[in-house]
């Protein structure tokens, strides 16, 4: 017997859609082999209609697709706009139609229920609004207008023009009678419930001259859209609920095992702690649509999500919703990287940010997630060189190591830097990742002087002391600028005396500026790296002043562990608002990005072996 399994019988009505799920053993071969949906002909041959390799037959063009979910051992065939001609015998299978693994499926498409002549069909999603149109003749213009609901053989009054409203429809129904000359009245029902489903009768007048019109109201629960994203990646739920609820509080919730829906985030400021640092609710557009971005996807994020609108910011019956079923693929294309990066006060972190390697030319960004209200993520640095002023001299985004990873270095750490950061690009939005920076106890590994004042025209020597644990690393000095850190020649001056209990491998590497010019003023970093992978850095600010006395200046190693003086920056710190992120230049596909907090992880020269998910930067 075939190990492929699915529904033996599928039945639906004309105009509807079906979503046929076929299950297969998720072996490595099965996961990657061709999947197909074919129709069995009289000859016994099975003609492919749609396959996982992108083929769609002309009969299915624009109305069918096949999606493989290798993680779950499932593929789904969606067919829309069904007609009676679609009735027949099909196979879903793997491999080749004639000799692969397959399963027989019978599809029956019927005409749908018989309705009274002239019945108008209204198909509306739950929570939305329907307007039922009821025509009448001139002689019934002054007479009572009413809408009834047919339940079995009886008719129950729903609303009439004498101000009666059935309690089940209280506060969500109105009957509108137009001015003279218009021979039609309308009944508007808001916030449709599933229980509103059924056959209705409009009536104007009474007795044998009355006008009647049947209306079949079909209230549909939204079918969840299947969303399949990679572990550690990002998902965006776009929620368009309509203008009627544009000014009502919005929410995203996740259905739990009790079939209730736990709020994940809403516009009233509520947020599930499990999503701290990795979620943003984008401000809504004028049409009331909004989106929610979740980064750092985990397996436990899988489930059914609903977005909706209600003044309480949570799910209530009769209000519009949209639904998604999120699957998280553990066979992720997004590489593992630390979710927590540790640094010490005064020290540094180097954060590795993954991006889609096919998009090496994309612009890269790093932003700080802020949890207030719906969350936002002001950009701190971008690959074109923008750096927020308060981060001058201590933040840099480097294209290295390349091939799917860029690096962000942040030094002169303070406790204020603890928090969540996002890495993102203006390309594939699914590659947004998040990292938490934690500030821990400890001393920086690299020792440099505090503030340095150089004299124009003279020689300046700045020492940087590296402990022995960095003996195998490449040491460098660079001059920081908005666009990166330009490497400078430096010289190894042999063992350092700044580290006791250490062997000859501790080094003193100096930067010499000779002669000092006005252009030399600015921030300098000394650091370590291994190939294209950066480790710790330390920063020094060099001020340049006019010559006062003759002679060269040398910053003595004895001052090397003095705390650097704090550089006072212009207090008018430039803040990149969400609208900057919405700039299409930044995010070709998604204006939401500005609000999407981007968190990034930091890679330190020393790795905390206590957890594969954490990198440490403390001195050991």
């Amino acid at each position: 017997k075939s190990p492929v399994f699915g529904p033996q019988e599928v039945s639906s009505v004309e105009g509807n859609s079906v979503s046929i799920k076929c299950y297969y053993p998720p072996t490595s071969v099965n996961r990657h082999t061709r999947k197909y949906w074919c129709r069995k002909g009289a000859s016994g041959r099975c003609i492919t209609l749609v396959s996982s390799e992108g083929y769609v037959s002309s009969n299915y063009a624009g109305r069918a697709n096949l999606t493989n979910f290798p993680e779950n051992g499932t593929f789904v065939v969606n067919i829309a706009q069904l007609s009676r001609d679609d009735s027949g015998h099909y196979k879903c299978g793997l491999g080749i139609n004639s000799r692969g693994l397959s399963f027989d499926v019978s599809l029956e498409v019927s005409q749908g229920p018989e309705l009274p002549n002239g019945t108008e069909v209204y198909t509306v999603d739950v929570g939305r609004t329907v307007t039922i149109k009821c025509p009448f003749k001139t002689e019934n213009a002054p007479k009572t207008k009413a809408l009834y609901k047919k339940i079995g053989q009886t008719s129950v009054l729903v609303i009439d023009s004498r101000n009666y409203v059935n309690p089940n429809y209280k506060d969500r129904i109105r009957l509108r009678i137009p001015g003279t000359g218009q021979l039609i009245f309308t009944v508007v029902i808001d916030r449709l419930r599933l229980s509103d489903h059924g056959l209705y009768l409009c009536q104007a007048g009474d007795g044998s001259n009355r006008d009647e019109k049947n209306a079949d109201l079909q209230v549909l629960e939204p079918e969840p859209e299947l969303v399949y994203e990679d572990l550690r990646g990002s998902v965006t739920f776009h929620c368009a609920l309509g203008l009627e609820v544009a000014n009502v509080a919005k929410f995203l919730c996740r259905v739990n095992s009790r079939e209730t829906c736990d709020v994940v985030i809403n516009t009233l400021g509520k947020r599930d702690s499990a999503f701290e640092g990795r979620i943003l609710l984008n401000p809504q557009d004028k049409d009331g649509s909004f989106s929610v971005v979740i980064t750092g996807l985990r397996k436990e994020d899988e489930g059914r999500y609903l977005c909706g609108a209600h003044s309480d910011g949570q799910l209530q019956e009769g209000w519009p919703i949209q639904a998604w079923q999120l699957f998280v693929n553990e066979e992720s294309t997004i590489p593992r990287s630390p979710t927590v990066v540790k640094g010490v006060a005064g020290g540094s972190v180097a954060v590795l940010c993954p991006y889609n390697p096919k998009e090496s030319q994309s612009l890269k960004y790093w932003c700080l997630w802020e949890g207030a209200q719906n969350g936002r993520c002001p950009l701190l640095v971008e690959s074109q060189g923008l750096v927020q002023e308060q981060y001058e001299g201590r933040l840099s985004l480097l294209q290295e190591p390349g091939n799917g990873t860029f690096t962000v270095i942040l030094n002169q750490l303070t406790t204020q830097d603890a928090g969540f950061y996002w890495c993102l690009t203006n390309g594939d939005t699914r590659w947004r990742t998040t990292v938490e920076i934690k500030i821990i106890e400890g001393e920086p590994n690299l020792k440099v002087p505090g503030n340095v004042t150089a004299v124009l025209g003279e020689t300046l020597n700045i020492p940087c002391h590296f402990p022995c644990k960095f003996s195998s690393y490449e040491k460098y000095w660079c001059k920081w600028s908005n666009t990166g850190c330009q490497t400078l020649p430096s010289q190894d001056e042999g063992p350092s005396e700044a580290f006791v209990n250490c062997d000859e491998n501790s080094r003193l590497v100096s930067l010499t500026l000779n002669p000092v010019t006005r252009a030399d003023e600015g921030w300098y970093w000394c650091g370590v790296k291994q190939g294209h992978f950066y480790g710790e850095t330390a920063a020094v600010y060099v001020a340049v002043e006019e010559k006062k006395v003759a002679g060269s200046r040398y910053v003595s190693p004895a001052k090397a562990d003095a705390a650097p003086d704090e550089k006072v920056l212009d207090s008018g710190v430039r803040e990149i608002e969400n609208k900057a992120i919405q700039d299409p230049r930044l995010f070709a596909e998604e204006k939401v990005v500005a609000d999407t907090g981007d968190q990034a992880g930091g890679s330190r020269a020393s790795v905390d072996s206590s957890s594969s998910e954490e990198q440490g930067g403390s001195s050991k």
Epitope: P7, S11, Y23, G112, H197, E221
Partner: nanobody, 129 residues
Framework: EVQLVESGGGLVQPGGSLRLSCAAS????????MGWFRQAPGEEREFVSA???????????YYTDTVKGRFTISRDNAETTVHLQMNSLKPEDTAVYYC???????????????????WGQGTLVTVSS
């Protein structure tokens, strides 16, 4: 919460028929998967059949190989009861039959017990001459 109550079990001769019913009460949904499982003495519980439906009137019916062509699953118009019509019964069909329901539709394999949130107490079917 949803309560499920099975009925229709009993003693029947080989080749005979029975119709099992599963009535759902409490909170009901417009989109469901309901399944039948069975457990023979000393055996593990196994999948028999399932039916999924959506609010637009689309149905999906699933059967295990051993009952295909003999059993038929259906749902009545009241939308709260699912039936399993069992024809050409065999002694090996003897088991306690359980009804199970999931209100969120089945995204995993409908043959898997873990897909179902709600379970009935079971009804005994004995096929013997």
């Amino acid at each position: 919460e949803v309560q499920l109550v099975e009925s229709g079990g009993g003693l029947v001769q080989p080749g005979g028929s029975l119709r099992l019913s599963c009535a759902a009460s409490g909170r009901t949904f417009s989109s469901y998967t309901m399944g039948w499982f069975r457990q023979a003495p000393g055996e593990e519980r196994e999948f028999v059949s399932a039916i999924s439906w959506s609010s637009d009137g689309t149905y999906y019916k699933y059967y295990t190989d051993t009952v295909k062509g003999r059993f038929t699953i259906s749902r009545d118009n009241a939308e709260t009861t699912v039936h399993l019509q069992m024809n050409s019964l065999k002694p090996e069909d003897t088991a306690v039959y359980y009804c199970a329901a999931s209100s969120s539709g089945t995204y995993g394999d409908p043959r898997s017990e873990r897909e179902y949130r709600y379970w009935g107490q079971g009804t005994l079917v004995t096929v013997s001459s």
